[in-house]
Each structure stands twice: as C-alpha cells, then as structure tokens.
Amino acid sequence: MGVEGCTKCIKYLLFVFNFVFWLAGGVILGVALWLRHDPQTTNLLYLELGDKPAPNTFYVGIYILIAVGAVMMFVGFLGCYGAIQESQCLLGTFFTCLVILFACEVAAGIWGFVNKDQIAKDVKQFYDQALQQAVVDDDANNAKAVVKTFHETLDCCGSSTLTALTTSVLKNNLCPSGSNIISNLFKEDCHKKIDELFSGKLYLIGIAAIVVAVIMIFEMILSMVLCCGIRNSSVY
C-alpha cells in the first residue's frame, strides 16, 4: 500500500525536485565532457605562457565539473527513483549522499575561503591564457568565448599587463560593445575585477553556498519524512 495525504505530496515534491537536479547534472556532465574532448579547448589546456606551462586550473576545473555532473545525476536519480518507488533503501542512500555532499560543501567553503587569493591568481592566469590563445590562434572560438564571458560577466576588458597587440584585438573585437569600457580600457581591469570578486563580492558566493546548503537540508528533511511515512504505511 502506497503513502497517502501529506506524505504523498512530499513524495512527488521530492521526485520533481530531484528530476530537475538529475537533468541539471546531465547538462553539466555533457558540457564538461564536450569541453574535455573539444580540440580547441585541448589547445587551451596545453598552452604555455612564456616558458611556464599553463596553470592546471582549467584542467582541474573540467574534472571537477565532470565529477559534479556525475554526482548530481547519481544523487538526483537516487532521490527520483527512491521517491517514486517508495524505497526506504534508496531514500536512505540518498540521505547519506546528501550528508556527505553537505560535509563536502562545508569543507570546500572553508578551503575556498582560506585559499581565495590563490584561486583568484589562478583565475587571472586562466583569463590571460585564454586571451593569449584568442589572439595568437584566432580560430580558437572556445578561448574567445571564455574571454567574452569574463568581459560580460565582470563588465571588464583586458588588464594593465597587456601588450599593445592584445590591446588592439581587445578594442576592436573582444571588448563588450556599446559600452564605455573601450575608452576606459585599463580602468575596467579584469584582473582588478577578479580580485574584487574574491574579496569584496565574497559574500555573494557565501549566499549562494548557504542557499545550496539550505536546499540540501530541506531535501534531507523531506527524504527522512518520506522514509518515515513509508515505514509507517507499511506497518498498517
């Protein structure tokens, strides 16, 4: 006999929630795998800056995305299937996974806060790297897309360390159009904006992390309530 009333409502809420979670995981995994195997991105990964090899931030970032996507799909599936099948075993596993993910998020948050300067440095290096690839090999559309994403997201263009050749390309091709950035190229320094993001705007990342944590706690509660409901309904 299935669950009834409020518990039934929780069952479908958990199903819908985790189906969306599973889909999002699939999208992230797909994009990450495409980035990993796309030849132009591979060029970016093996790019050298001067006599120094490129930072492995991007490489690590792609593998983190693959892991995040896979975990999201797995956890989403557990929640989805566990809810619709009313399986205590699957819901118990789902709950355990959420506890582990919650612990990972807290650990990642602490690590990120402690290492924010290094992360900011790596992000700046990655931006420089993408910019170099976009100028030298202008067929590298991924590199251009990365640069444009930086520019549009952070509302910046270039950095004070640029060469004249890069500046020419930025002014004419890679700066956000229709903005006053081109005339204030070095005032809207992307390196400065990245630093600001990791210091002044850290609270935004914190809020995002708290929102994710609250959703996780909410899902944990729902899965436990549903689990108890299933147990109780099987008693009668």
């Epitope: 030298v136 090999d137 202008d138 060469t163 004249a164």
Partner: antibody, heavy 123, light 110 residues
Framework: EVQLLESGGGLVQPGGSLRLSCAAS????????MSWVRQVPGKGLEWVSS????????YYADSVKGRFTISRDNSKNTLYLQMNSLRAEDTAVYYC????????????????WGQGTLVTVSS | QSVLTQPPSASGTPGQRVTISCSGS????????VNWYQQLPGTAPKLLIY???NRPSGVPDRFSGSKSGTTASLAISGLRSEDEADYYC??????????FGGGTKLTVLG
Amino acid sequence: EVQLLESGGGLVQPGGSLRLSCAASGFTLGSYWMSWVRQVPGKGLEWVSSISSSSSYIYYADSVKGRFTISRDNSKNTLYLQMNSLRAEDTAVYYCARQRIGDLVVHYGLDVWGQGTLVTVSS
Amino acid sequence: QSVLTQPPSASGTPGQRVTISCSGSSSNLGSNTVNWYQQLPGTAPKLLIYGNSNRPSGVPDRFSGSKSGTTASLAISGLRSEDEADYYCEVWDSDSYVTFGGGTKLTVLG
C-alpha cells in the same frame, strides 16, 4: 626554405583597381599573422594592413582604410591585397611580410619578407 | 610624419661603433617592445633585432639593441662596408598598429 613571393603589381590609372597576391612556401601560412608594407621608391617604409591567422582580426592604416581589403586563403597558402580607388600617392613597392608573435602576445616584428611588387598609379 | 623619430643619416669608418637612435612617446615606444630592420640597397627589409634586444638566427652579434624609457637604440660595433644600408625601428602601437620610424641611412666612410 621559407619564402614569400608577391605578384599582381603593375601600371594602373587613378581610380582603378589592382589585386596583389603573396604566395607563401616553406611554412604554413595559416599559423601566422600577415602584413602588407609599402615603400615609395627612395622613401621610408609604411605599414598598410595586417590580418590574423584565421582572418578574425584585420587592421588598416588610415591612409588606405575603405579602399584596400586584406584577405587570405590558408588552403592555398596565399595572402591578398585588393586595392580599389587607387591614387597617385599609392605608387610604391608593396611587400608582404610574416608577423612574428612571441610569448605573452608580444609583437616581435616582421620576420619574413617578400621581394616586393611595384604598383604604379599614373594616367 | 612618423611618430617614431630617427636621425636621417649616420656614418662611421670601418671598425668603428655606430649607434642609431629611435625616439617615441610613452604610448608607443615607452610601453611596447621595439624591432629593428636593415634594408640593403635594392633589397627587401630584413628583421635585425626583435623584442628590444634579441637577434634572429643569422644576424651577427655585432648588432645589438636596447631600450630605455621612450628611446631605443641600435648599436653596430666593428662597422663593415656591407653594413651600409637603411635602418628602421618599428613598434606595434595599440592605436595606430604597426608604426615605422622614418629610417636612418648609414654610410660607411673610407
């Protein structure tokens, strides 16, 4: 041997058109930015235009903007300069040159030059 | 009128050291690397020095380049008769792109 060979020069009337070609050998044209530079006989060098490896970024000197068009066909290993609305002051030897870009996108000059082709604009 | 200023002429006797200057502004020479070219009579220019002071392979070490502030210099030591040519400095400027100096005609005397 790395070489550039220009062709297409000649005598043309003012207002006329001419298309210069530059064939590359000994290297893959598609891996390099390329430029056209001109020199009035007995005078100094004047940069005309530059084009990036896949034609995404193109630059012109103010004196030729709107009249000249730089292009390339990487499959044919050839660089072009289409010259329209030619004037007497465009009379010069036109050189095509390979642009050298160093680490961290530093412009390291024009490291390979063709022998040049003479364009004479006269009525 | 070039934005990079070179002396129109320079001269020296064989074995002597000759220096050719190239002066610009903070927006071109001051913030970018300079390249030097040699153009022998009746031939195409040849890259002599790139990135302020680097020599391409095949260029004798008698040729050296340096830059200080908004002035670049090309030095030729142990001058030879075959060094008689026109010399040009050049930079990539972010606004006017490839910019050449007016050129210096080097004459080897005697």
